[in-house]
Amino acid sequence: FERTRSLQDPCSNCPAGTFCDNNRNQICSPCPPNSFSSAGGQRTCDICRQCKGVFRTRKECSSTSNAECDCTPGFHCLGAGCSMCEQDCKQGQELTKKGCKDCCFGTFNDQKRGICRPWTNCSLDGKSVLVNGTKERDVVCGPSPADLSPGASSVTPPAPAREPGHSPQ
């Protein structure tokens, strides 16, 4: 089958890194600079991705594979193949249109990326709050109030200020 295909289509013999040049009687020509073909039998080479601006080159383009980009310090990749670079924030913050904003009361972010998430609702598991949550850290749930030994007490988180209702801890 392969031999038959080769007889029918001489381009199928062109390996990765080359293209089947119609202008030169369908012979295999190497990909020009700044282009590549990652599979055999290609009739054109693809233009290499250029990592500019906030993108930086993680892997150079070769005749058989595209360049790979990542982000400059202070930014992180988003999307397939690092299609976007998003600004890092500090822990305890999330990105908005206007840049990094502190997490609202009742939420936290322990990373430099992503959004603020609500503190864990300890009462869902019949537990109580052992350590209060902060902007950077989730609450720590402890044993249920009934399980506490005499004299011990669980922490009651402060009431929210002007935020919408956060579920009881």
């Epitope: 999330e94 908005t96 249109k97 206007k98 904003k101 609202c104 992503g114 609500p118 919408p164 579920s167």
Partner: antibody, heavy 121, light 109 residues
Framework: EVQLVQSGAEVKKPGSSVKVSCKAS????????IYWVRQAPGQGLEWIGN????????FYGEKFMGRATFTADTSTSTAYMELSSLRSEDTAVYYC??????????????WGQGTLVTVSS | QVVLTQPPSASGTPGQRVTISCKLN????????VHWYQQLPGTAPKTMIY???KRPDGVPDRFSGSSSSNSASLAISGLQSEDEADYYC??????????FGGGTKLTVL
């Protein structure tokens, strides 16, 4: 393919409760907020509240505090909204929607098809 | 509390350009992204514009969005009969609390 599929229409009596489900598929359920939004007949969209299925943390709009309860079952990737002490003004289509994790002020990229809840004596 | 105000109705003839505004009662709409949804009768809202001016895949480039300090707008050029729907703007009071405009009913004459 991301999908949010909601439970069917409900007819309820005033004073009773209703529980609407929203089954998610095609993504990691625990990594995105689920928001609940309702729309009364001929009216606009109204935020009820939201849940982070990853840890069960919830927020409620002031108007719905004490009456709405959100839960999430991570084993079935299903979010639930229960609304109690129903009154005729609660007659509406109830939607669940997903918010991406790009930014704190992002849009709702996927919506359930909506569940009509009718409150009538 | 943040209130987003939209005109209750808008209209245009096929081929025309129509703009729907979304005004903020106070503060600065520039602090948070504005998103626009189209709702056809009996269906769930569909995103037409997100993050002020971005168009999801599959939304015609006849739809565009813009935002200034205290208002945002959705523009539809080359109006078509299938554009007849309700349109809602959406932003935030805080990153926990979404706010919706009252909606604009667009009629294609």
């Amino acid at each position: 393919e991301v999908q949010l599929v909601q439970s069917g229409a409900e007819v309820k009596k005033p004073g009773s409760s209703v529980k609407v489900s929203c089954k998610a598929s095609g993504y990691t359920f625990t990594s995105y907020y689920i928001y609940w939004v309702r729309q009364a007949p001929g009216q606009g969209l109204e935020w009820i509240g939201n849940i982070w299925p990853g840890n069960g943390g919830t927020f409620y709009g002031e108007k719905f505090m004490g009456r709405a309860t959100f839960t999430a079952d991570t084993s079935t990737s299903t979010a639930y909204m229960e609304l109690s002490s129903l009154r005729s003004e609660d007659t509406a289509v109830y939607y669940c929607a997903r918010r991406p994790d790009y930014s704190g002020d992002d849009y709702f990229d996927y919506w359930g098809q909506g569940t009509l809840v009718t409150v009538s004596s | 509390q943040v209130v987003l105000t939209q005109p209750p109705s808008a209209s245009g003839t096929p081929g025309q350009r129509v703009t729907i505004s979304c005004k903020l009662n106070s503060g600065n709409i520039g602090s948070y992204y504005v998103h626009w949804y189209q709702q056809l009768p009996g269906t769930a809202p569909k995103t037409m514009i997100y993050r002020d001016d971005k168009r999801p895949d599959g939304v015609p480039d006849r739809f565009s969005g813009s935002s200034s300090s205290n208002s945002a707008s959705l523009a539809i050029s080359g109006l078509q009969s299938e554009d007849e729907a309700d349109y809602y703007c959406h932003s935030y009071d805080s990153t926990i609390t979404p706010v919706f405009g009252g909606g604009t009913k667009l009629t294609v004459l």
